[in-house]
């Protein structure tokens, strides 16, 4: 089978601090040494890029300094964390994996993780 399969959880609930974590696992049809992982957000059939990182197999994922994503990798598994989420960011987050090097190139796209974000209630003022 030449197509690459990507698995990710169907649903994740963000923490009260607006942090959501999920695992993105891919079945590699080739022996890639350089992999690119992209998180996409799909809302109303529009797809936008949330963050992306390219890493060497065996090394850590490095997102840009200003990225809202962090992650670690272990074999064909990537642990992704998205920070700074608010209720309006609730949506479908798709894990896209590309085996970049050596050729041939392979693309794998997960079915998406529905991330639910609930803004915390503001603390009531205390009267003493």
């Amino acid at each position: 089978c030449k197509a690459m399969h990507v698995a990710q959880p169907a649903v994740v609930l963000a923490s009260s601090r607006g942090i959501a974590s999920f695992v993105c696992e891919y079945a590699s049809p080739g022996k890639a040494t350089e992999v690119r992982v992209t998180v996409l957000r799909q809302a109303d059939s529009q797809v936008t890029e949330v963050c992306a990182a390219t890493y060497m197999m065996g090394n850590e994922l490095t997102f840009l300094d200003d990225s809202i994503c962090t992650g670690t990798s272990s074999g064909n598994q990537v642990n992704l964390t998205i920070q700074g989420l608010r209720a309006m960011d609730t949506g479908l987050y798709i894990c896209k994996v590309e085996l970049m090097y050596p050729p041939p190139y392979y693309l794998g796209i997960g079915n998406g993780t529905q991330i639910y974000v609930i803004d915390p209630e503001p603390c009531p003022d205390s009267d003493f």
Partner: antibody, heavy 118, light 107 residues
């Protein structure tokens, strides 16, 4: 408006060279992988080459490997195809195409015709 | 290299009819399959990606289905502007390959 405009096509003798350009506008060019696809007269579509957003990764069809070189200049929002050792079978309309976030080729230029003949 | 087969090469319909085109891959491409429309003298236009998702601005009379090796593209009710050549393409691995195309012409 999202747009790709190719240029540089023309008539060239077998063994000759040509450089195609593709000018992008209306989107953040540096964020997208790009492709060249060709179509011989009366025939179907054939993928030629692909280049990643930062030029780090490049792929070629076997039919052009060693003869064609893809490149890009993100500062100029431009994609290029340097074609050397041209053959009659390279005669085609050459299209540049953007790779969409989900993988397919979502935006295409109008094409530029390359004719290789003596 | 993954080979895509489209059959037949030409299909003839009258406006208003339903058109169903097929594309078969030599090995599994999962759902990494797109459909393009091309009219004479024009560039291809993306219609369907991911086997069944419509591209932005594409009318809902166009639809796609299938996964693995067998795919179907359907135009529910042919409009005069739909008579063109339709190509399938796999984009899951390089080299990215296209089918030979199916021409939909007027009966």
């Amino acid at each position: 408006e999202v747009q790709l405009v190719e240029s540089g096509g023309g008539l060239v003798k077998p063994g000759g060279s040509l450089r195609l350009s593709c000018a992008a506008s209306g989107f953040t060019f540096s964020s997208y992988s790009m492709n060249w696809v060709r179509q011989a007269p009366g025939k179907g579509l054939e993928w030629v080459s692909s280049i990643s957003s930062s030029s780090s990764y490049i792929y070629y069809a076997d039919s052009v490997k060693g003869r064609f070189t893809i490149s890009r200049d993100n500062a100029k929002n431009s994609l290029y195809l340097q074609m050397n050792s041209l053959r009659a079978e390279d005669t085609a309309v050459y299209y540049c195409a953007r790779v969409g976030l989900m993988g397919p080729f979502d935006i295409w230029g109008q094409g530029t015709m390359v004719t290789v003949s003596s | 290299e993954i080979v895509l087969t489209q059959s037949p090469a030409t299909l003839s319909f009258s406006p208003g009819e339903r058109a169903t085109l097929s594309c078969r891959a030599s090995q599994s491409v999962s759902s990494y399959l797109a459909w393009y429309q091309q009219k004479p003298g024009q560039a291809p236009r993306l219609l369907i990606y991911g086997a069944s998702s419509r591209a932005t601005g594409i009318p809902d009379r166009f639809s796609g289905s299938g996964s693995g090796t067998d795919f179907t593209f359907t135009i529910s009710r042919l409009e005069p502007e739909d008579f063109a050549v339709y190509y399938c393409q796999q984009y899951g691995s390089s080299p990215f390959t296209f089918g030979p195309g199916t021409k939909v012409d007027i009966k």
